[in-house]
Interface confidence: medium
């Protein structure tokens, strides 16, 4: 059974041409986190496995920078970047956590972030 | 030594399914992506898509979405590319090749390839 | 997509010519690109990665340079087991593309 929750930054907003910390953070199971996957809709951002450590998609190495931890951080931000971005977490025994975080980048120098919440 | 080794040459009416297999042998299996590239007849190279195998992440190709799929058996450590909906366009050699996991994108070996024919 | 297109697309030179091909892509692509030689019926094989870098075992008169949207693959002296197509590849976005080929023969 799973009984995890992963729990994001939510709804987050930031400038255009600035930076954004994308983070998820898996609690309330003992399952073994193997990798964990960033994706914009189908994309593949990047992935950190256990093992093998960060491997960051093409289309997006100069930009991305990996971490702080498992999360992952998004530079030279435009207006296309708004969207949905996924962190999925490959756990042991437990199976696939999903978090959704919603990135709006705006043309003004107003961004406030949104208020954290949990997807079971 | 590293090797790639494919299935056999396979002939398909217009509409079936395909499926390549490449077994990996002479390194670590999930420390490399499989990538699978194509070439017909006489023409040039078209990268169809990627699965990594300790996790089963996989990025396709748009132009191929639809159409395919990627698996893998790690116990055997063989990767499996299925091709859908055929048609005479798809008559091509397929490679598989891998990749390293990490910074620097290259695929230093191949398969020895497999032709598919699509023929009424 | 990233178009990359290759120049020429085939080329006849003499054993211990210098022999130049030129891939230009469609973007800019920051020097994400390799080159790989095909013989007829084989796989191709990869020879030089990340515009200049040569890989393990490949012999020295294969090299390569670049940057921005244009790239160059150079034999130094064409040797008669140089003749072969020699492909550009981007990797600087997904999908990674190819150039569409260069076909080198002895005169």
């Known amino acids: 059974m799973m009984t995890g929750t992963i729990e994001t930054t939510g709804n987050i907003s930031a400038e255009k041409g600035g930076s954004i910390i994308l983070q998820c953070h898996l609690s309330s199971t003992t399952a073994q986190v193997t990798q964990v996957n960033w994706e914009q809709q189908d994309q593949l951002l990047a992935i950190c496995n256990a093992d093998l450590g960060w491997h960051i998609s093409p289309s997006f190495k100069d930009r991305v920078a990996p971490g702080p931890g498992l999360g992952l951080t998004l530079q030279s931000l435009t207006v296309n970047d708004t969207g949905e971005y996924f962190c999925i977490y490959h756990t042991y025994p437990d199976g696939t956590y999903t978090g959704r975080i919603f990135l709006e980048v705006l043309e003004s120098s107003v961004a406030e972030h949104g208020a954290r919440f949990q997807i079971p | 030594q590293v090797q790639l080794v494919q299935s056999g040459a396979e002939v398909k009416k217009p509409g079936a399914s395909v499926k390549v297999s490449c077994k990996a042998t002479?390194?670590?299996?999930?420390?490399?992506?499989i990538e699978w590239v194509r070439q017909a007849p006489g023409q040039g190279l078209e990268w169809i898509g990627e699965i990594l195998p300790g996790s089963g992440s996989s990025y396709y190709n748009e132009n191929f979405k639809d159409r395919v799929t990627m698996t893998r058996d790690t116990s055997t450590s063989t990767v499996y590319m299925e091709l859908s909906s055929l048609r005479s366009e798809d008559t091509a050699v397929y490679y598989c090749?891998?990749?390293?996991?990490?910074?620097?994108?290259?695929?230093?070996?191949w398969g020895q390839g497999t032709l598919v024919t699509v023929s009424s | 997509a990233i178009q990359m297109t290759q120049s020429p697309s085939s080329l006849s030179a003499s054993v211990g010519d210098r022999v130049t091909i030129t891939c230009r892509a469609s973007?800019?692509?920051?020097?994400?690109l390799n080159w790989y030689q095909q013989k007829p019926g084989k796989a191709p094989k990869l020879l030089i990665y990340y515009t200049s870098s040569l890989h393990s075992g490949v012999p020295s008169r294969f090299s390569g340079s670049g940057s921005g949207t244009d790239y160059t693959f150079t034999i130094s002296s064409l040797q008669p087991e140089d003749i072969a197509t020699y492909y550009c590849?981007?990797?600087?976005?997904?999908?990674?593309?190819f150039g569409q080929g260069t076909k080198v023969e002895i005169k």
């Open positions: 973007q800019g692509i920051g020097n994400y």
């Open positions: 590849h981007q990797y600087s976005k997904l999908p990674y593309t």
């Open positions: 002479g390194y670590t299996f999930s420390n490399y992506w």
């Open positions: 090749a891998r990749q390293k996991y990490g910074n620097f994108y290259y695929f230093d070996f």
